[in-house]
Interface confidence: low
């Protein structure tokens, strides 16, 4: 079975900068999985943000500003990355990655 690890326990960002979060997949080939990213803002329910499927298809939650989040999968490092552009106060949250094995 696949295993997920998010190396950065916490991240402090300067406003307007770009944050890149990592999710390392082990125990299974990342190219044969779909990776989902979620965020949980303080006091709010967890929310789906974006996913990248085994075939590279990216799906984003409607209502999220275009270009705000970019998701990718890097086979060389078996890592999925979530890039958050133009970091602002509304982006303060806990971000989770999840795995769907095909």
């Amino acid at each position: 079975a696949g295993h997920l690890e998010q190396p950065q326990i916490s991240s402090t960002k300067t406003l307007s900068k770009t944050a890149r979060l990592e999710c390392v997949v082990s125990g299974i080939t990342i190219s044969a999985t779909s990776v989902y990213w979620y965020r949980e803002r303080p006091g709010e329910v967890i929310q789906f943000l974006v996913s990248i499927s085994y075939d590279g298809t990216v799906r984003k939650e409607s209502g999220i500003p275009s270009g705000k989040f970019e998701v990718d999968r890097i086979p060389e490092t078996s890592t999925s990355t979530l890039t958050i552009h133009n970091v602002e106060k509304q982006d303060i949250a806990t971000y989770y990655c999840a795995l769907w094995e095909v």
């Epitope: 991240s11 900068k17 270009g67 970019e70 086979p75 890039t83």
Partner: antibody
Framework: EVQLVESGGGLVKPGGSLRLSCAGS????????MNWVRQAPGKGLEWVSS????????YYADSVKGRFTISRDNAKNSLSLQMNSLRAEDTAVFYC??????????????????WGQGTMVTVSS | EIVMTQSPGTLSLSPGERATLSCRAS???????LAWYQQKPGQAPRLLIY???SRATGIPDRFSGSGSGTDFTLTISRLEAEDFAVYYC??????????FGQGTKVEIK
Amino acid sequence: EVQLVESGGGLVKPGGSLRLSCAGSGFTFRSYDMNWVRQAPGKGLEWVSSISTSSGYIYYADSVKGRFTISRDNAKNSLSLQMNSLRAEDTAVFYCARDRGIAVAGDYYYGMDVWGQGTMVTVSS
Amino acid sequence: EIVMTQSPGTLSLSPGERATLSCRASQSVSSSYLAWYQQKPGQAPRLLIYGASSRATGIPDRFSGSGSGTDFTLTISRLEAEDFAVYYCQQYGSSPPYTFGQGTKVEIK
């Protein structure tokens, strides 16, 4: 081998246009922000433009804003710079450079870690 | 716009000597967002230091970076023949995203 190769430079008259290309190989091109940096003869480095991984964020130096357009094709691992209304002061070697962006853990800038060999653009009548 | 000013313009030293290059920002820059590059004649620049003090892959430990706020330093502890080149500092910001210093040439005395 991780590599960037620029092409498209040459001699052009003032007011003319030129399109530069940069081909990436040996790495997952779509995962990196990309930049164009230029260097006039005998001068220092000048950042020209940058583009984010999915082209959602694009920036230009004031000196080229409105005249240059950066774009990328992740399916072809290529970066382009369309240069219009060229001026004599645009004469320079143009480099494309890979940008590793901002690291989250530790919060630091990784820098431009891979550069092409450069392509010369000469604007003269 | 943040202006990066490097000094001296030229540094004349002998192999084996210590080189100290300065980079000053017109306003405070996070040390996290400061990089140094080396460029030799006819070649593309090469990343040396990122995050003000972290050496890039393959860079020898005679190169070190330090500083914070507006003042940053690149030190080459013992100059070797291949170290004679031009060095640039660069800051990452948001308007514009990048600014380079004008460069410091390290030449053989």
